[in-house]
């Protein structure tokens, strides 16, 4: 060994100076009398050596590095050797911090595992090898006096976390627990803990079920789940409350809590739910009133509550066949009395016969809005009813009266945009109690199965929007039926388009004749059409070669014009415009040619 | 200090009934399961039912079930045990117990002799 | 049901002894596993519970080991009024069973 490094300190501070020292021996002989020593750290040379011979013969180097910066690095005394670099010596020099208190220690009895678990935050990294102890001893009183200490528990390398086994501890009793960190640089000891692992419990959640549904026992309410809990057993005698959560399993909605709930609870009831809706229940407990942690979530138990009877008002309308005015189309709409007014699963039709006490006949049982029946020659009314599991919804009598009473006068209807109609009336004297709107295609297109209705309930309104099945560009029919207390007025009916379509194609135009000043055009009309309003006016446009135009303005009931004033043997591109106030659509256009000067007329 | 004192005990007939009490001073009684633990003349112990600290629990050995029932009246400090349809086996001394968190019996009375004969 | 299997049933020892008691669950119980000592005609005493804690007022001479299926009762230095019999419980399930009890007599 020609050279050997010795250091101030092999591990410092990050940022600190460290001193190093290189002696060549003299029995190099090989090397230059007066050789020069260079350091270098890592791959960088670093100049401010300071070079001595000793008395002894041998060459010493010495170097301050003001900061070491880095974490790790190797600090290489070197000579050059011909034209390169040789290292004689190097050491390993490491740079870092002291380790931080360790915080945040939190520990948790596990019963299962019989072991106390301790975890902790290490704090920032020290760069350095750090080691973790948790030490502990036990104390009878409030830890202020040490009892007897428990063997030093050591984490794996790189885990924040140590188990104590149950034969180091003493249930009921305090321990002090603490976490010692330590490296090169120094060492640290986080607050201690004074516990005793019991009040320090995490226990197991119980499992969560639905009850068994018993003969004898009242089926839940609508909105209410019937549940009960199997406490986990080994925590069976420890005193704990719990809670529980549960959520819709549909939709963003966040967990509701329920509790505080014993641990034993036979039987649960939950209400105030939503009914008819699949909820995710979960319960977890805690040791109480004694100290202790939260157990996790149980798993999760899924049920559905019960739905409730439909608590709806069922608007009703009917019609008579023209050919058999004993076949009766009834027509309903449920209106909701409740912000959740139960599921509807279908709807019954029936009839009470006079003298028949009890007996209802159904007439039909639907899940349409609507069925068509028979009704036998004695029925006046009929009842309607919407049903589910739960029940039914209290009882719409219909009654199939004559058009006993007055009608209303001056319906019209106008466009408010193009997928609504405005229907207005006068009401007549005295007030109905409300009306029955029907709207659907005009003719060609009508038909008495597709229409729309609505109930007005004030009698005292004077029109309606109508914004369902409304499309632009078709003829509506509105039917206006005045409701009274046991009769009904004359319907009275309107045509209406919410919005007319522009015409679809203007007509062709043809040259009837021609002169070398003039052209005389003529078309065929278009036939209306349904659904496009009718023309206002015709425009013709005509341009000359040199891109000049022109134009005219012609009533809707022109076949023809003539165009005056035009340059002889010129080109002429000329075509027409058909509006409406939907709107205005371009013909081809047609081109021509006037005559030549010397020419005769064209007829 | 703990006390648990157990009456009720006596000579009675097979298919006759009994009921034993167990009156408990010294500690918060209506936060502890409390149980009964049996021992026939010259056999070891044997557990007979236990019951949760509000009463809503009360498990029992299968060689009870459907004839004993375990109770207690928190205000009164006291648990019971109503033995009915008793059988010449059911003669034993009967301990009253306090258990622990861990289901260990903590405190126990002196016991009641109940001897079923005819 | 977990049945608790004690052993001996009976053994003899002079004060002074080290005397070992062992118990084996039929499943494994964790750590809920009690002690306790009985004497002729009076109430048992729950020396250990959850398998090795000693109990308020036990002298330290007694202790317990083992978790899951096997247990041992161990009293260090055995003294004229350990002279009993020991029984061990399993507290982690109902039915809570008892062993059948080692009888601790005078050699």
């Known amino acids: 060994e020609c050279g050997h490094i010795s250091v101030s300190a092999p591990i410092v501070h990050l940022g600190d100076p460290i001193t190093a020292s290189c002696i060549i021996k003299q029995n190099c002989s090989h090397l230059d009398p007066e050789p020069q020593i260079l350091w270098r750290l890592g791959a960088e040379l670093q100049p401010g050596g300071r070079q001595q011979r000793l008395s002894d013969g041998t060459q010493e180097s010495i170097i301050t590095l003001p900061h070491l910066n880095h974490t790790q690095a190797f600090l290489s005394c070197c000579l050059n050797w011909g034209n390169s670099l040789q290292i004689l010596d190097q050491v390993e020099l490491r740079a870092g911090y002291p380790p931080a208190i360790p915080h945040n220690l939190s520990c948790l009895m596990n019963l299962t595992t019989s072991s106390l678990i301790c975890q902790w935050e290490p704090g920032p990294e020290t760069h350095l090898p750090t080691s973790f102890t948790l030490k502990s001893f036990k104390s009878r009183g409030n830890c202020q006096t040490q009892g007897d200490s428990i063997l030093d528990c050591v984490p794996k390398d790189g885990q924040s976390h140590c188990c104590i086994p149950r034969k180091h501890l003493l249930l009921y009793q305090n321990m002090g627990i603490w976490v010692q960190a330590e490296n090169a640089l120094g060492t640290s000891m986080s607050p201690q803990l004074c516990l005793d692992p019991m009040d320090v419990v995490k226990l197991e959640p119980p499992m969560l079920r639905t009850m068994d549904p018993s003969p004898e026992a009242a089926p839940p309410q609508a909105g209410c789940l019937q549940l009960c809990w199997e406490p986990w057993q080994p925590g069976l005698h420890i005193n704990q409350k719990c809670e529980l959560r549960h959520k819709p399993q549909r939709g963003e909605a966040s967990w509701a809590l329920v509790g505080p709930l014993p641990l034993e609870a036979l039987q649960y009831e939950l209400c105030g739910l939503l009914p008819a809706t699949a909820y995710t229940l979960q319960i977890r407990c805690i040791r109480w009133p004694l100290p202790g942690h939260w157990s996790d979530w149980s798993p999760s138990l899924e049920l559905r509550t019960t739905e409730r009877a439909p608590t709806v008002r069922l608007d009703t309308w009917w019609r008579q066949r023209q050919l058999d005015p004993r076949t009766v189309q009834l027509f309903w709409k449920p209106v909701p009395l409740e912000e959740d007014s139960g599921r509807i699963q279908g709807y019954v039709v029936s009839w009470r016969p006079s003298g028949q006490a009890g007996a209802i006949l159904p007439l039909c049982n639907t899940t349409e809005l609507s069925c068509t029946f028979h009704l036998p020659s004695e029925a006046q009314e009929v009842a309607l009813v919407a049903y589910n599991s739960a029940g039914t919804s209290r009882p719409t009598p219909v009654v199939f009266s004559e058009s006993r009473g007055p009608a209303l006068t001056r319906l019209h209807a106008m466009a408010r945009d193009p997928h609504s109609l405005w229907v207005g009336w006068e009401p007549p004297n005295p007030w109905p109690q409300g009306y029955v709107i029907e709207w659907g295609l005009g003719p060609p297109s009508a038909s008495n199965s597709n229409k729309t209705w609505r109930m007005e309930q004030n009698g005292r309104a004077t029109g309606f929007l109508l914004k369902e099945n409304i499309r632009p560009f078709q003829l509506y029919e509105i039917i206006v039926t005045p409701l009274y207390q046991d009769t009904m007025g004359p319907s009275q009916h309107v045509y209406a388009y919410s919005q007319e379509m522009a015409p679809s194609h203007a007509p062709e135009l043809h040259l009837k004749h021609i002169g070398k000043t003039w052209a005389q055009l003529e078309w065929v009309p278009e036939p209306p059409e349904l659904g496009k309003s009718p023309l206002t006016h015709y425009t013709i446009f005509w341009t000359n070669a040199q891109n000049q135009s022109f134009s005219a303005i012609l009533n809707a009931s022109s076949r023809g014009f003539v165009l005056h004033g035009l340059e002889p043997a010129s080109l002429y591109h000329i075509h027409l415009m058909a509006a409406s106030q939907a709107g205005a659509t371009n013909s081809t256009v047609l081109t021509l040619m006037t005559l030549t000067p010397e020419g005769s007329e064209l007829h | 200090e703990v006390q648990l004192l157990e009456s009720g005990g006596g000579l009675v007939q097979p298919g006759g009934s009994l009921r034993l009490s167990c009156a408990a001073s010294?500690?918060?009684?209506?936060?502890?399961?409390m149980g009964w633990v049996r021992q026939a003349p010259g056999k070891g112990l044997e557990w007979v039912s236990s019951?949760?600290?509000?009463?809503?629990?009360?498990p029992y050995a299968d060689s009870v079930k459907g004839r004993f029932t375990i109770s207690r009246d928190n205000s009164k400090n006291t648990l019971y045990l109503q033995m009915n349809s008793l059988r010449a086996e059911d003669t034993a001394v009967y301990y009253c117990?306090?258990?622990?968190?861990?289901?260990?019996?903590?405190?126990w009375g002196q016991g009641t002799l109940v001897t079923v004969s005819s | 049901d977990i049945q608790m299997t004690q052993s001996p049933s009976s053994l003899s020892a002079s004060v002074g002894d080290r005397v070992t008691i062992t118990c084996r669950a039929s499943?494994?119980?964790?750590?809920?596993l009690n002690w306790y000592q009985q004497k002729p005609g009076k109430a048992p005493k729950l020396l250990i519970y959850?398998?090795?804690n000693l109990q308020n007022g036990v002298p330290s001479r007694f202790s317990g080991s083992g978790s899951g299926t096997d247990f041992t009762l161990t009293i260090s230095s055995l003294q004229p009024e350990d002279f009993a019999t020991y029984y061990c419980?399993?507290?982690?399930?109902?039915?809570?069973?008892f062993g059948g009890g080692t009888k601790v007599e005078i050699k």
């Open positions: 117990a306090k258990l622990g968190e861990l289901g260990q019996f903590m405190d």
């Open positions: 010294g500690f918060t009684f209506s936060l502890y399961w």
């Open positions: 019951i949760s600290s509000s009463g809503g629990v009360t």
């Open positions: 499943q494994g119980i964790s750590s809920y």
């Open positions: 959850y398998a090795s």
């Open positions: 419980q399993q507290s982690l399930e109902y039915p809570q069973m």
